[in-house]
């Protein structure tokens, strides 16, 4: 699905300071799904505010979020998944600011989990893999996964490479030798929902071998 | 109550340009993307594609691409559609409507006919 | 492209009857119980009108008698009890992948 291609960066103008973000994960437990909303400015006073959702929803008109500590959740199986959805802060029964959202354009994966690198010394590569719980999903089963990775002497040179399976092979000779490596991995949808990346995985440490020429070989 | 106001009919010869309107009201403009659907005479319907009002972004169905720019103007909660190098094949109803959801389209002008005609 | 297929071509039924439209997919539009097939109404000279979203849901405001189901590439929509004011071209829509695409359309007259 193309989407919608960008063309500048005109957000609402809020009128308060009530302005908020939220994303939604799908069957993040069992078949529950989750809507996640917090305030844009972390020093918003958040006494007496709350969360509604109201449109999109099964068999209720709207559902109110649960506060932890400064961000304000649900956990249903009554979102609809198609329409949008108005979401409001309110205060005493009356709503500061509202915004109409399609749940499934907001949707944030799981991270993914068990990232592991294993040497081939036959074939002079390294084979990454990962898993992600989103396999076993029913809605949000189709992913494009961001594998960074690093040497760890380079703080902020990360190379990526984007895949759709969970499984990329690494050539030696695009490696240093004898290094420490960090790798890691994020998801983000990639057929109908849209939404955000996922957390990075924790991060996997391997070092490559010495550069081993045997005698008569000749450098790669 | 919410509305979709489109533009006059227009008659314009091959190799010309036109530009139709859509004025929405009764809602807050940005909440909804407007898309727009080519009907040609005695025929069905055909998605030409649509713009989100709060970013300005567009998506266009692969077969329009050249032929229509959407634009949109959120002070006048107006969306406009542009036409190019005209033909006889473009003669059709065009119309603008509200996407509800991703992507069917619960509130709709009251269509525009364009008709290429030297 | 999906191309979504409608039938029948035209449909002619009495008042009170049941009138059925089936609308085929090349390929599913459906994510496990996200069904997004959406059907519309028009009647000549107007625009068209949004009957069913999301394969079953009723639009607000459009009458009982009309109710959607199927799943994958298999959809209907039906009309029970037809009535008189029901004349019109019927449309079904894909909104699962660019481009959304429409049926050909169904033409239902009541006798």
């Known amino acids: 699905e193309s989407g919608y291609a960008q063309n500048g960066d005109l957000e609402d103008a809020e009128l308060d300071d009530y302005s908020f973000s939220c994303y939604s994960q799908l069957e993040v437990n069992g078949s529950q799904h989750s809507l996640t909303c917090a305030f844009e400015d972390p020093d918003v006073n958040t006494t007496n505010l709350e969360f509604e959702i109201c449109g999109a929803l099964v068999e209720v008109k709207c559902l109110s979020f649960r506060k932890l500590q400064e961000i304000y959740f649900i956990e249903t199986k009554k979102f609809l998944l198609i329409g949008k959805s108005n979401i409001c802060v309110k205060v005493g029964g009356k709503s500061l600011t509202c915004k109409k959202i399609d749940l499934t354009t907001i949707v944030k994966p799981e991270a993914p989990f068990d990232l592991s690198v294993i040497y081939r010394e036959g074939a002079n590569d390294f084979v990454v893999t990962f898993n992600t719980s989103h396999l076993q999903k029913k809605y949000v089963k189709v992913l494009m996964h961001d594998v960074a990775y690093r040497q760890e002497k380079d703080e902020n040179k990360w190379m990526h490479v984007n895949l759709s399976s969970t499984k990329l092979t690494l050539l030696q000779r695009n490696l240093q030798p004898e290094a420490m490596y960090e790798i890691k991995v994020r998801s983000i949808p990639d057929h109908y929902f849209k939404g955000f990346w996922s957390e990075w995985s924790p991060s996997y440490y391997f070092r490559t071998p010495e550069i081993n020429n045997s005698p008569g070989e000749m450098d790669p | 109550q919410v509305q979709l106001v489109q533009s006059g009919a227009e008659v314009k010869k091959p190799g010309a340009s036109v530009k139709v309107s859509c004025k929405a009201s009764?809602?807050?403009?940005?909440?909804?993307?407007l898309h727009w659907v080519k009907q040609a005479p005695g025929q069905g319907l055909e998605w030409i594609g649509g713009?989100?009002?709060?970013?300005?972004?567009?998506a266009y169905n692969q077969k329009f691409k050249g032929k229509v720019t959407l634009t949109s103007d959120r002070s006048t909660s107006t969306v406009y559609m542009e036409l190019s190098s005209l033909r006889s094949e473009d003669t059709a109803v065009y119309y603008c409507?509200?996407?509800?959801?991703?992507?069917?389209?619960?509130?709709w002008g009251q269509g525009t006919t364009v008709t290429v005609s030297s | 492209d999906i191309v979504l297929t409608q039938s029948p071509a035209s449909l002619a039924v009495s008042p009170g009857q049941r009138a059925t439209i089936t609308c085929r997919t090349s390929e599913s539009v459906s994510i496990h119980l996200l069904h997004l097939m959406h059907w519309y109404q028009q009647k000549p000279g107007q625009p068209p009108k949004l009957l069913i979203y999301g394969a079953s849901n009723l639009e607000s405001g459009v009458p009982a008698r009309f109710s959607g189901s199927g799943s994958g590439t298999d959809f209907t929509l039906t009309i029970n009890p037809v009535e008189a004011e029901d004349t019109a071209n019927y449309y079904c829509q894909q909104s699962i992948k660019d481009p959304y695409t429409f049926g050909g359309g169904t033409k239902v007259e009541i006798k």
């Open positions: 009764g809602y807050r403009f940005t909440d909804y993307e």
């Open positions: 713009i989100d009002p709060k970013t300005g972004g567009t």
């Open positions: 409507a509200r996407s509800g959801g991703r992507w069917y389209f619960d509130v």
